[in-house]
Amino acid sequence: IINGSDCDMHTQPWQAALLLRPNQLYCGAVLVHPQWLLTAAHCRKKVFRVRLGHYSLSPVYESGQQMFQGVKSIPHPGYSHPGHSNDLMLIKLNRRIRPTKDVRPINVSSHCPSAGTKCLVSGWGTTKSPQVHFPKVLQCLNISVLSQKRCEDAYPRQIDDTMFCAGDKAGRDSCQGDSGGPVVCNGSLQGLVSWGDYPCARPNRPGVYTNLCKFTKWIQETIQANS
């Protein structure tokens, strides 16, 4: 997250970190069910661990943390690497979470976002770009949903209805390491960090997010079919 600020503790209990060995963060994710995460489809990896209830990026033990293995990864059938359409994936955890103040699912919004809606994006991704500099703790950033026209103007021929753009002033954006993390609007999960320009936070080049309102049926049916 570029030019965000430290999230208040316990305010993002659905935020997950996807880790490679040894404790290498590569993506964020979101708890949407006691045993299921949502993340970006481009975050698919064979072997990874899931960390929930953790505030700092470092692997130091925190009393609220819960660690899991991903036992099943189900990318949306319409996703094709390295494209950006349909960029979502469900991950089944090896067991159900223990609900606490630090670990709790969030509901996926069935309503599509309208321009001007205020949202919060969070993650442990780099706070500088193109340099790489990781934060000590989870970062939060207020962003506003942009109209689909502004989105298409920013990225001609690259936007479809499985995506929406959101941004704030120039210099504020999600970035590498934030993929798959939550965009929360009005208390529900509206999007996932997906893609954007490189370096991040360029003027008139907003972040692009997976438009989850288009996928509520697929999410529900996939969880039911695999539970």
């Epitope: 993506c27 991704g125 790489v132 999600s174 934030d178 798959g180 960090v193 893609w195 972040g207």
Partner: antibody
Framework: EVQLVESGGGLVQPGGSLRLSCAAS????????MNWVRQAPGKGLEWVSY????????YYADSVKGRFTISRDNAKNSLYLQMNSLRAEDTAVYYC???????????????????WGQGTTVTVSS | DIQMTQSPSSVSASVGDRVTITCRAS??????LAWYQQKPGKAPKLLIY???SLQSGVPSRFSGSGSGTDFTLTISSLQPEDFATYYC?????????FGGGTKVEIK
């Protein structure tokens, strides 16, 4: 079959210009970032330039900055390298290479160059 | 710029030998290192990405390890087709930089 084929190399005098082309086939060219990498005779690999899938991000090695221009035409599945003010030290085999990393994607994960052309030879000599 | 230093610059080995090549980055690059194989007159071929992940179609006798600044490419049992030059490359930071190469020759 996934393939990259370079062309446009040749003999040119110092100070001259050349335009290299790289024709891509067998994959969705418009989805991938691309690179030019060169190799001087008997030497190692030297990265020259990078261009993102939509051409919004471009990088050059310091040794070619201000003299070389990378571009692409996604409609033609083609990558280009315009080389001006050529010097003897630019003599090399030039490869185009597909970058597996999408710098647009916001994961923190990097791959490498997974598909390379056969190379085209540029000789700068008087 | 990040400097990549490979060692040794050449190694003589026999079929069946275990060969180890090292690569050192001038600053930490996490796990973001790729290894390539190049045979004379041919283009480089990606062997390993993210320091230890084997590229599709590459034999399992090739393996990579390391993180931060120190990385290793190991060929567990050298085969005749493995005699070539090997390069490491750091990929997260522009300008991308390669190591100087290690030539694996027949003893």
């Amino acid at each position: 079959e996934v393939q990259l084929v370079e062309s446009g190399g040749g003999l040119v005098q110092p100070g001259g210009s050349l335009r290299l082309s790289c024709a891509a086939s067998g994959f969705t060219f418009s989805s991938y970032s691309m690179n030019w990498v060169r190799q001087a005779p008997g030497k190692g690999l030297e990265w020259v330039s990078y261009i993102s899938s939509s051409s919004s991000t471009i990088y050059y090695a310091d040794s070619v900055k201000g003299r070389f221009t990378i571009s692409r035409d996604n409609a033609k599945n083609s990558l280009y390298l315009q080389m001006n003010s050529l010097r003897a030290e630019d003599t090399a085999v030039y490869y185009c290479a597909r970058d597996l990393t999408s710098m647009q994607s916001r994961d923190y994960y990097y791959y490498g160059m997974d598909v390379w052309g056969q190379g085209t030879t540029v000789t700068v000599s008087s | 710029d990040i400097q990549m230093t490979q060692s040794p610059s050449s190694v003589s080995a026999s079929v069946g030998d275990r060969v180890t090549i090292t690569c050192r980055a001038s600053q930490g690059i996490s796990s973001w290192l790729a290894w390539y194989q190049q045979k004379p007159g041919k283009a480089p071929k990606l062997l390993i990405y993210a320091a230890s992940s084997l590229q599709s179609g590459v034999p399992s006798r090739f393996s990579g390890s390391g993180s931060g600044t120190d990385f290793t490419l190991t060929i567990s049992s050298l085969q005749p087709e493995d005699f070539a030059t090997y390069y490491c490359q750091q990929v997260p930071i522009f300008p991308y930089t390669f190591g100087g190469g290690t030539k694996v020759e027949i003893k």
